[in-house]
Interface confidence: low
C-alpha cells in the first residue's frame, strides 16, 4: 500500500482583497480514518482556520461535500480576504484516536493579498517662501500588498529627480506604507503649477493613482513698487501713484504717508488675476501743493503676506510750481524691494 | 511505470475530439498527470493537469474552455473542445514526480493530432 | 502573465566544449524549475528538478543552478549524444506550469 499524501498542489496563490481565496488541498487515500485540519503557520504557535467537527468558522467553507462517502477533497474557500489574512496556509491530516494524533501535513499554499494603495495625499510647506528657495512636498499612502509600488513626482508634466522614498516596514508585513518628499525649487512664475504625486501598483492595473499640490499654496511672490507724479493739474493737486505689481498672494496692505504722518490706509481685495496668477494693483494720492510751503516726502508703504514693510518714497517739489509740472521729481526707495 | 496516449487522428475543425492517456506500474491516484502539447516544429506548452485522490484540475489560461481533462482508475482523458487549425499537434501525457510537485518524470510517446478541412 | 524566457535560441559548440543556456522567469519561482532535452521524434527526457538536482540517471556533465528568477543550464565536456532541443520548466504551481521556448544545441 503506497504511502498516504496530502497534496496541496498551489505552493501560493494571491488573491485581491475583498475578494474569496480557494486553498486546494486533497489526499491519495481514505486510510487511515481520521479528520482533516487547515492550519495557518507552522509549529506550536500555528493558527487554527477550519476543522470540520467543531468550531466557527463563519468565513470559510468547505469546497466539496466533506461528509461526502469517499471525499478525499479538502480544499476550502475563505471569503472576504484581508490583508491580515497573509500567510502560509497547511492541510494537515489526523489519524482518529483520543485525542486524534497528527499524520502528515500538506507542503503548504503561501496566500498574499493584492490590497490597493489608498490614494496618495500631499501636504506642502507650512509655510510660503519665495522664488528661488526650496519647499518640500510630501506624499503618502498606505494600505497596500504586495511591498513592489512605483511613486513618481512630476511638477507641471515634468518628473521630478530630488526625490526620497521609503517604504514602510522593510520586513515582511501584511500591508505596507508609501512615503515620499519631493524638493522643488520654485520660481515667481509657479502661481498656476502644480505638484503631481503618482503611485502604481500591481493592484491598479496600469492606472495609477495621483495626489496633488497647487504651488500657489506654498509660494509667496513679493511686489515690485514703482511710484510715479502724473501732471499737475489746474487746481493745484498732484496726483501721485503707488503702482504695485506682480504679488502673490492678494493678502496686502498699501499706506500712503506724507512726510512720515499717515494719510491713507488700504486693503487689496477682489483684484484682477494676471495670466500668471500674480496681482497687481495701483493707488492714487492727490496732494495739495498750495497748503505746503516746503517739498512734500510721499511714501509707499507696502505689507505683504505678513512680511516686513517695503517703502518707496517720492518729493513733490512745490517751492515753485508752476501750472504744468511734469514727472521729474525724484524717487527714493528707502525700503528693500523683494525681487 | 510508463504511459501511452491513443486517440490522435485527423479530424476536421470543430468536431469534438478525446485523446487518452493509459498508465502502468502507479495509480493515478497518488500522482497528477499533466498535458502537454508541441505544434510542428515549435516549443512544448503545458495544457492542463488533473490531481491525484480527486478530480481537481488546473488549466493554463489559454486552453481554459478550450480542454477538458478527466480521469478514471486508470486513464486520464484529454477532451479538444471545438479544435482549430491551431491545435494541429503532438500531444503527451506526463506523470508529476510526486502529486503537487508537477515536472514530469515519465512520458508517454505522444499521439499526433492532425486538424484540417 | 507569467513566462519564462530562454536564451539563445540555439547554440552551436563543438565536441568536448561547454554550452551554457539561461532559463529567466518574470517573477520569483524560488527554485521550482526543471530542464529537460529532447531529441527529435521522442518525449522530453527529465534532466534537473528543484534547479539544480540531477534527475536519475543523469551525467553530472550536466548542472543546474540558480534560484528566484534566474537558472542557468551548463553542458559540460559536450558529446555528440548532448545534440537535442532543451526546455526549462517553471511548476510554481498550476498558474505558473509553462515551459520556455527552447534552445536547440548543435554539436560539431
Known amino acids: 500500500e503506497e504511502e498516504l499524501q496530502v497534496i496541496q498542489p498551489e505552493k501560493s496563490v494571491s488573491v485581491a482583497a475583498g475578494d474569496s481565496a480557494t486553498l486546494n488541498c486533497t489526499v491519495s487515500s481514505l486510510i487511515p480514518v481520521g479528520p482533516i485540519q487547515w492550519f495557518r503557520g507552522a509549529g506550536p504557535g500555528r493558527e487554527l482556520i477550519y476543522n470540520l467537527k467543531e468550531g466557527h468558522f463563519p468565513r470559510v467553507t468547505p469546497v466539496s461535500d466533506p461528509t461526502k462517502r469517499n471525499n478525499m477533497d479538502f480544499s476550502i474557500r475563505i471569503s472576504n480576504i484581508t490583508p491580515a489574512d497573509a500567510g502560509t496556509y497547511y492541510c494537515v491530516k489526523f489519524r482518529k484516536g483520543s485525542p486524534d494524533v497528527e499524520l502528515k501535513s500538506g507542503a503548504g499554499t503561501e496566500l498574499s493579498v493584492r490590497a490597493k494603495p489608498s490614494a496618495p495625499v500631499v501636504s506642502g510647506p507650512a509655510v510660503r517662501a519665495t522664488a528661488e528657495h526650496t519647499v518640500s512636498f510630501t506624499c503618502e499612502s498606505h494600505g497596500f500588498s504586495p511591498r513592489d509600488i512605483t511613486l513618481k513626482w512630476f511638477k507641471n508634466g515634468n518628473e521630478l529627480s530630488d526625490v526620497q522614498t521609503n517604504v514602510d516596514p522593510a520586513g515582511k508585513s501584511v500591508s505596507y506604507s508609501i512615503r515620499s518628499t519631493a524638493r522643488v525649487v520654485l520660481t515667481r512664475r509657479d502661481v498656476h503649477s502644480q505638484v503631481i504625486c503618482e503611485v502604481a501598483h500591481v493592484t491598479l492595473q496600469g492606472d495609477p493613482l495621483r495626489g496633488t499640490a497647487n504651488l500657489s499654496e506654498a509660494i509667496r511672490v513679493p511686489p515690485f513698487l514703482e511710484v510715479t507724479q502724473q501732471s499737475m493739474r489746474a487746481d493745484n493737486q498732484v496726483n501721485v501713484t503707488c503702482q504695485v505689481t506682480k504679488f502673490y498672494p492678494q493678502r496686502l496692505q498699501l499706506t500712503w504717508l506724507e512726510n512720515g504722518n499717515v494719510s491713507r490706509t488700504e486693503m487689496a481685495s477682489a483684484l484682477p488675476e494676471n495670466k500668471d496668477g500674480t496681482y497687481n494693483w495701483t493707488s492714487w494720492l492727490l496732494v495739495n501743493v498750495s497748503a505746503h510751503r516746503d517739498d512734500v516726502k510721499l511714501t509707499c508703504q507696502v505689507e505683504h503676506d505678513g512680511q516686513p514693510a517695503v517703502n518707496k518714497s517720492f518729493s513733490v517739489k512745490v517751492s515753485a510750481h508752476p501750472k504744468e509740472q511734469g514727472s521729474n521729481t525724484a524717487a527714493e526707495n528707502t525700503g528693500t524691494n523683494e525681487r | 511505470q510508463s504511459m501511452e496516449e491513443s486517440g490522435g487522428r485527423l479530424v476536421t475543425p470543430g468536431t469534438p475530439l478525446t485523446l487518452t492517456c493509459t498508465a502502468s506500474g502507479f495509480s493515478l491516484s497518488n500522482y497528477g498527470v499533466s498535458w502537454v502539447r508541441q505544434a510542428p516544429g515549435k516549443g512544448l506548452e503545458w495544457i492542463g493537469i488533473i490531481y491525484g485522490g480527486s478530480d481537481i484540475t488546473a488549466y493554463a489560461s489559454w486552453a481554459k474552455g478550450r480542454f477538458t481533462i478527466s480521469k478514471t482508475s486508470t486513464t486520464v482523458d484529454l477532451t479538444i473542445t471545438s479544435p482549430t487549425t491551431e491545435d494541429t499537434a503532438t500531444y503527451f501525457c506526463a506523470k508529476s514526480y510526486t502529486n503537487g510537485m508537477d515536472y514530469y518524470n515519465i512520458w508517454g510517446p505522444g499521439t499526433l493530432v492532425t486538424v484540417s478541412l | 502573465a507569467f513566462d519564462l524566457t530562454q536564451t539563445p535560441s540555439s547554440v552551436e559548440a563543438p565536441v568536448g566544449g561547454t554550452v551554457i543556456i539561461k532559463c529567466q522567469a518574470s517573477?520569483?519561482?524560488?527554485?521550482?524549475l526543471a530542464w529537460y532535452q529532447q531529441k527529435p521524434g521522442q518525449p522530453p527526457k527529465l534532466l534537473i528538478y528543484s534547479a539544480s538536482t540531477l534527475a536519475s540517471g543523469v551525467s553530472s556533465r550536466f548542472k543546474g543552478s540558480g534560484s528566484e528568477t534566474q537558472f542557468p543550464l551548463t553542458i559540460s565536456d559536450l558529446e555528440s549524444a548532448d545534440a537535442a532541443t532543451y526546455y526549462c520548466?517553471?511548476?510554481?504551481?498550476?498558474?505558473?506550469?509553462?515551459f520556455g521556448g527552447g534552445t536547440e544545441v548543435v554539436v560539431k
Open positions: 517573477q520569483s519561482i524560488s527554485s521550482y
Open positions: 520548466q517553471s511548476y510554481y504551481g498550476s498558474r505558473s506550469n509553462v
